[in-house]
Amino acid sequence: LKGQEFAPSHQQVYAPLRADGDKPRAHLTVVRQTPTQHFKNQFPALHWEHELGLAFTKNRMNYTNKFLLIPESGDYFIYSQVTFRGMTSECSEIRQAGRPNKPDSITVVITKVTDSYPEPTQLLMGTKSVCEVGSNWFQPIYLGAMFSLQEGDKLMVNVSDISLVDYTKEDKTFFGAFLL
Amino acid sequence: LKGQEFAPSHQQVYAPLRADGDKPRAHLTVVRQTPTQHFKNQFPALHWEHELGLAFTKNRMNYTNKFLLIPESGDYFIYSQVTFRGMTSECSEIRQAGRPNKPDSITVVITKVTDSYPEPTQLLMGTKSVCEVGSNWFQPIYLGAMFSLQEGDKLMVNVSDISLVDYTKEDKTFFGAFLL
Amino acid sequence: LKGQEFAPSHQQVYAPLRADGDKPRAHLTVVRQTPTQHFKNQFPALHWEHELGLAFTKNRMNYTNKFLLIPESGDYFIYSQVTFRGMTSECSEIRQAGRPNKPDSITVVITKVTDSYPEPTQLLMGTKSVCEVGSNWFQPIYLGAMFSLQEGDKLMVNVSDISLVDYTKEDKTFFGAFLL
């Protein structure tokens, strides 16, 4: 390649190369939830399946006690879907009676717990008013985005009401993260 | 690894390095659907545009006959959005008449078909009750997550009612996957 | 390698390797919007926080004047969530009076502006009819997909009604992109 200069500078490598197959990754799927104690004014955390069916963790990304454990600092794409289901919310009944009402709601939060900050950090929130006319309702909330995480950080998914979560199928409610 | 700090091993390479630009990728966009025969109790599959406008397939990721064909084993991020639209669902009319009703619903499923398993596998499902008050309604369902796929696997998007899919714009209804 | 045919293996490198940590990336978070002039029939663009809290831009991905600027050609995953909130839409009130009505709606569009094309390109659209029974409503629209972008392209997020956007929390409304 005599006399050939290297191509544009974004192709230069300023950090160690690494094989993509070696990156921390996890996809967790829903399981039936057992009622757990949680702090007042703090949404309960879901726990997850991490090895059966579609679920997996790999390359030092581990799952334990409701948390995904981040084994390596870097930028991660984090996502979750929670499917909720319930009976008619009180809202529509009150509405029928002619009294406007602050609607019921469903909320999903992906939360980071880090030792470099004393308070859990809400990374992503999906929140939706529920004021259904039909007798039974169901709907998903999906979230996903990229965040800079530190080695040792812990991720969890919190929901406004654990009893409304559809835990029946692994494709309806899930949680995942992968190092970019 | 009790009490062990996370090793800095992620800088070691245990798998072949590969250029990111060489990875299988596809983004497919909606086209007008032609009614097709499908099995009873099985949702019909959408077919897609794979080369015009925003749509593309590259690096041996091919599209054929409603399926994305996986050319290489690995972890893929798979996503789809389907925008549905319809007239007032029966639900609200029945509700008006004072009869509670199981609501109508809209559902999207991303399905994997694999040689090594006789049954299609539902990877992702977004399902929502539809019980609208207005005369015309429209709304998207978005799905996305990471899965370990094998060379030769096929991916498709199934919907509960093909006639409700908004096929008018390539940015409203789409399907994609890329090797991580 | 005399006489050896090139293997079909995906482990061969046809493009320059590059460190993942060197790739253009951004995650932008919502700020309070100031009313801005926008063309009739064109949705207004949101502006964003790019460095405080969870927000960041890195590796030559810059944010300026409502636009993410693409510094390098390639395939990008682009995503956004916008949380909307409002009072009861007119729709249900009109419905109460017995007049069917085209429902109000909320829409998010991720738009690409490119030098080589006179018209902005709509990459992603999430649009939903809003016909709520309760007095206050709120809900997110999430979008995400992969697109081939060119160096110099600009990305923005447009919404149907800027006054309905929930700007109160960085985890509710956000916009991001990263080179794959």
Epitope: Q37, F39, A45, N62, T64, N65, K66, F67, L69, V113, T114, D115, S116, Y117, P118, E119, P120, G152, K154 | L1, K2, G3, Q4, E5, F6 | -
Partner: antibody, heavy 116, light 106 residues
Framework: QVQLQESGPGLVRPSQTLSLTCTVS????????MHWVRQRPGRGLEWMGR????????KYNPSLKSRVTITRDTSKNQVSLRLSSVTAADTAVYYC?????????WGQGSLVTVSS | DIQMTQSPSSLSASVGDRVTITCRAS?????MYWYQQKPGKAPKLLIY???NLASGVPSRFSGSGSGTDFTFTISSLQPEDIATYYC?????????FGQGTKVEIK
């Protein structure tokens, strides 16, 4: 009520190993991180290290790393500190601290004297 | 290590005075924490994330700053504020504290 209680011998001989236990109550300590901080007489505060009880992942102050070990026992809701080869310079009040979930909580401290 | 340089090391002020303590980090940090320690007691968190007031802490305490320079302020000194105040960064390894500022009443 959230509580952290340090316990252990108040006197340790030089060259021996200092061992302290922190027993927590009122919260799931796997949801947070547990640190050890010490304060030598008339001196400021020195961070020694921390453990994530969920994963047992530890981080240590490099200046103490060769001598310090932090472990946890989830069945007992306890975190333990071991500091080997102690000298008189290790005489201090040792605090167990919770972080990662407000409020930031400190134990009342345990005075350990290193003396022969 | 990230060194934390706190100043002054001690100060004496009257009840009602505005008191300011500064902390400089040897390299940029995202967050700063401020603690109050009374004699014979464990430190108590007052400010986290540079400017957030911890639960139950009176509003006369405040924090500000970013990067390497941070400030802690007591807007109106009260007799119960007699204590030693420490800044701390939670980012680099090791976590490090300032050397402390002893606040006394004139």
């Amino acid at each position: 009520q959230v509580q952290l209680q340090e316990s252990g011998p108040g006197l340790v001989r030089p060259s021996q190993t200092l061992s302290l236990t922190c027993t927590v109550s009122g919260f799931d300590f796997q949801d947070t991180y547990m640190h050890w901080v010490r304060q030598r007489p008339g001196r400021g505060l020195e961070w020694m290290g921390r453990i994530d009880p969920a994963s047992e992942h530890t981080k240590y102050n490099p200046s103490l790393k060769s001598r310090v070990t932090i472990t946890r026992d989830t069945s007992k809701n306890q975190v333990s500190l071991r500091l080997s080869s102690v000298t008189a310079a290790d005489t201090a009040v040792y605090y167990c601290v919770r972080s990662g979930g407000l409020p930031d909580v400190w134990g009342q401290g345990s005075l350990v004297t290193v003396s022969s | 290590d990230i060194q934390m340089t706190q100043s002054p090391s001690s100060l004496s002020a009257s009840v009602g005075d505005r008191v300011t303590i500064t902390c400089r980090a040897s390299s940029s940090v995202s967050y700063m924490y401020w603690y109050q320690q009374k004699p014979g007691k464990a430190p108590k968190l007052l400010i986290y994330g540079a400017s957030n007031l911890a639960s139950g802490v009176p509003s006369r305490f405040s924090g500000s700053g970013s990067g390497t320079d941070f400030t802690f302020t007591i807007s109106s000194l009260q007799p119960e504020d007699i204590a030693t105040y420490y800044c701390q960064q939670w980012e680099g390894n090791p976590r490090t504290f300032g050397q402390g500022t002893k606040v006394e009443i004139k």
